[in-house]
Interface confidence: low
């Protein structure tokens, strides 16, 4: 593996070469963690402490802000409860989603009293509207956590908010909720560690199963404590959970509870020299690469190790067909003298738990009509026995010999002279961004990773907690506790002044145009353009 970056740029070098624009935060704010990209309006909305920002995608120095603090009473209540006045007793924005054409929906911790509201953004970008609906505040329980330290994953579709969060002051009652909309709120089973066991939610995504929207599923990515017997000692497992979009809860024991919730373990590991696999279990971030077929996005996951002794990070790729295969496989069941987890061998009730009510797979019209045996089975068998293994059964990127860990990932699919390449932008806990290209070898999923760039994007080392990529603007946006940074996806001119250097870089964004290393456009009919991503061979492509 080529672990030395082709380019390593310090913050100073990034500034001097005009390759980074930074918003260094406001004195009375912090925690620029919640991002919402709006390519149509050319805005990046950012939720932070007591503020929501609207940044211009062209240049983040141009921004509008909404101040949304908590009342003195709320702040005092929070303080009396023994919380930190600066780090906890404020309104940390945790949810920021597009509600409709004219409004966003935002939720914050509200000084341990979660609160939500709508933000008016107008019909058109030129309306230049960005204001809080002061008259319409809603209870944020089950939408935002009480504690700003806790992670939340949310998704707003068709006026309904799906969120994975903690629903209580103590931060013990974790659940996946569906709120808003016209239906009764639905949640995962309460106080049942088989469903969720102290989870840390990462993200939520809507993925179609078929051409019938009734089959649409919401997938949650999270990490959680492994259940006793599943693993010796205390361990973390990365998970993917599924819920049918048209799940309206069941009857009796699952009234207002999900009936189609299932979860499976995501494996990201490398074989060790002693025959014991090294597991990267701490899922940190997920990116879905939608290309051609929206039903089958490629899932990119960023993982770190749980161990304090051995620190490492990895990126694993998963296919949705593998995920679906696992959800159609055996359920995990506790049995035997040691009460350990085994694949369930008994009769699975019909319709199979986890199947969405629809015409496609037949059977039933609503989850409320599910037979008792399906409800009972679903309630006690939320986990699948088989895990989901990554494509090629191993990570595509591994970093173990460094003083940092991966925290975030976004991926861009780039057209190059010799094919399409996925370029990963990986954020770290020290404020650097790695730009990595995965290059297919014999088969498209057998990949070689090439580290193109390592860029420091913040003045002080600070963990990157949010990232968005704009293909339209060809820019990357990065969030941390300290502020927001913006950088171009490519810096072709920095690779050098010769064709060979440009070709050796193996950056799919760049090609030698006869006089300089510049942005490669597949549509440009230039016979002189030299680029070789697969092999990085200048001898064949450069005549100078």
């Amino acid at each position: 593996k080529n672990n030395v970056p082709r380019l390593k740029l310090s913050y100073k070098e990034m500034l001097e070469s005009n390759n980074v624009i930074t918003f260094n935060g406001l004195a009375n704010s912090s925690s620029y963690h919640t991002f919402l990209l709006d390519e149509e309006r050319s805005r990046l909305y950012v939720g932070a402490k007591d503020h929501i920002f609207s940044f211009d995608l062209v240049n983040i120095k141009d921004f509008q802000k909404i101040v949304w603090p908590v009342s003195y009473t709320r702040r005092d209540e929070c303080k009396w409860a023994g919380k930190d006045i600066l780090k906890e007793c404020a309104n940390f924005i945790k949810v920021l989603k597009a509600y409709n054409q004219t409004h966003l929906y935002a939720c914050g911790t509200g000084a341990f009293h979660p609160i939500c509201t709508y933000i008016e953004i107008g019909h058109h970008p030129e309306d230049n509207i960005f204001k809080l609906e002061n008259s319409h505040f809603e209870n944020g329980r089950g939408k935002s956590p009480y504690d700003p330290k806790l992670l939340t994953a949310s998704l707003l579709i068709d006026g309904e908010l799906y969120s994975g969060t903690a629903a209580d002051f103590m931060g013990r009652d974790f659940a996946i909720f569906r709120t808003l909309g016209h239906h009764h709120p639905i949640r995962t089973e309460q106080h049942d560690s088989r469903w969720l066991n102290d989870p840390k939610f990462i993200s939520a995504h809507l993925i179609s199963e078929s051409d019938n929207p009734e089959d649409d599923k919401v997938y949650f990515f999270f990490r959680e404590n492994a259940i006793d017997g599943e693993h010796s000692g205390k361990a973390t497992h990365a998970r993917i959970g599924q819920i049918c979009k048209n799940d309206f809860g069941g009857h009796r024991s699952l009234v207002n509870k999900w009936t189609t919730f299932l979860k499976a373990r995501l494996i990201c590991s490398v074989p060790g020299p002693n025959g014991i696999d090294t597991h990267f279990d701490e899922l940190q971030d997920v990116f879905l690469m939608n290309f051609k077929d929206p039903k089958n996005p490629v899932v990119y996951g960023v993982f770190t190790t749980s161990s304090n002794i051995f620190k490492g990070s990895a990126v694993c790729m998963y296919s949705m067909s593998d995920v679906r295969r696992v959800f159609l496989g055996p359920y995990a069941h506790r049995d035997g003298p040691n009460y350990q987890w085994v694949p369930y061998q008994g009769r699975v009730p019909y319709p199979r738990p986890g199947t969405c009510p629809s015409k496609t797979f037949g059977g039933f019209d609503s989850t409320k009509d599910l037979p008792d045996d399906v409800i009972t089975f679903a309630r006690s068998h939320p986990a699948m026995y088989n895990p989901v293994f990554p494509m090629n059964n191993r990570p595509i990127v591994i970093k173990t010999d460094v003083n940092y860990q991966f925290t975030q990932i976004v991926v861009d699919r780039v057209d190059a002279e010799d094919g399409q390449y996925d370029v990963m932008f990986i954020g770290t806990d020290v404020g650097t961004v790695l730009k990595v290209v995965s290059i297919p070898k014999e088969t498209w999923y057998d990949l070689e990773e090439v580290l193109l760039e390592e860029m420091t994007v913040f003045r002080e080392p600070t963990a990157i907690s949010a990232m968005e990529l704009s293909t339209k603007q060809q820019q990357l946006y990065i969030g941390s506790t300290a502020g927001v940074a913006q950088l171009p996806l490519h810096r072709c001119d920095i690779y050098g002044k010769a064709c060979a250097e440009c070709c050796l870089a193996r950056d799919p964004y760049c090609a030698w145009d006869g006089s300089a290393c510049s942005r490669y456009f597949p549509t440009a009919k230039r016979a002189t353009r030299a680029q070789d991503i697969r092999n990085g061979d200048p001898l064949t492509h450069c005549s100078d």
Epitope: Q190, H191, D192, S193, R334, T376
Partner: antibody, heavy 116, light 111 residues
Framework: EVQLLESGGGLVQTGGSLRLSCAAS????????MSWVRQAPGKGLEWVSW????????YYADSVKGRFTISRDNSKNTLYLQMNSLRAEDTAVYYC?????????WGQGTLVTVSS | QSVLTQPPSASGTPGQRVTISCSGS????????VSWYQQLPGTAPKLLIY???HRPSGVPDRFSGSKSGTSASLAISGLRSEDEADYYC???????????FGGGTKLTVLG
């Protein structure tokens, strides 16, 4: 048919101990959280304690914290309540109840009398 | 002193409609499901209403539950003599991490 049958109640001196049992049948015991609820003579219901289906978590009312211990044996379909340092105010009928977001089934109760 | 507040007594004549109230706070009724229990003289309590307004099978549709904000109520229509009992509301309390009951309402069927 769901059945819950409590036993182990009786007369005990202040400071003494008792162990209540609740035998469950008619449902998959290991799938459900279970609870104890008590009712002092002529008074209302008071929740005492509850336990996860797998004993993973246990919760107690402040009035019994540190004195009572809830436990279960899923292989025997039995719920227990170990009561130590008993006080006169612990005198009540103790009901075992199946938890399903609420107490959907109750036993007939067993009377515990603490005399001074 | 119960966490949930119920009137100590209520009464009605056969055929009448009676409502029993139960008030709490945002940490219990406001954000959690409410249940109602019926306790006939000398017997164990029985679940009457769960998840605010749902009836378990076997409970007559004369019994109905509703909730608004931090208050809940149980309505009994077409009152019958066999409805004479103690009625308790209950809910999970997030701040106490425990289940709380109302003090109970003794329903008397007159005449």
């Amino acid at each position: 048919e769901v059945q819950l049958l409590e036993s182990g109640g009786g007369l005990v001196q202040t400071g003494g101990s008792l162990r209540l049992s609740c035998a469950a049948s008619g449902f998959t015991f290991s799938d459900y959280a279970m609870s104890w609820v008590r009712q002092a003579p002529g008074k209302g219901l008071e929740w005492v304690s509850w336990i996860y289906y797998d004993s993973g978590s246990k919760y107690y009312a402040d009035s019994v914290k540190g004195r009572f211990t809830i436990s279960r044996d899923n292989s025997k379909n039995t719920l227990y309540l170990q009561m130590n340092s008993l006080r006169a105010e612990d005198t009540a009928v103790y009901y075992c109840a199946k938890l399903n977001g609420d107490f959907d089934y109750w036993g007939q109760g067993t009377l515990v009398t603490v005399s001074s | 002193q119960s966490v949930l507040t119920q009137p100590p007594s209520a009464s009605g004549t056969p055929g009448q409609r009676v409502t029993i109230s139960c008030s709490g706070s945002s940490s219990n009724i406001g954000n959690n499901d409410v249940s109602w229990y019926q306790q006939l003289p000398g017997t164990a309590p029985k679940l009457l209403i769960y998840a605010d307004s749902h009836r378990p099978s076997g409970v007559p549709d004369r019994f109905s539950g509703s909730k608004s904000g931090t208050s809940a109520s149980l309505a009994i229509s077409g009152l019958r003599s066999e409805d004479e009992a103690d009625y308790y509301c209950g809910a999970w309390d997030s701040s106490l991490s425990g289940y709380v009951f109302g003090g109970g309402t003794k329903l008397t069927v007159l005449g």
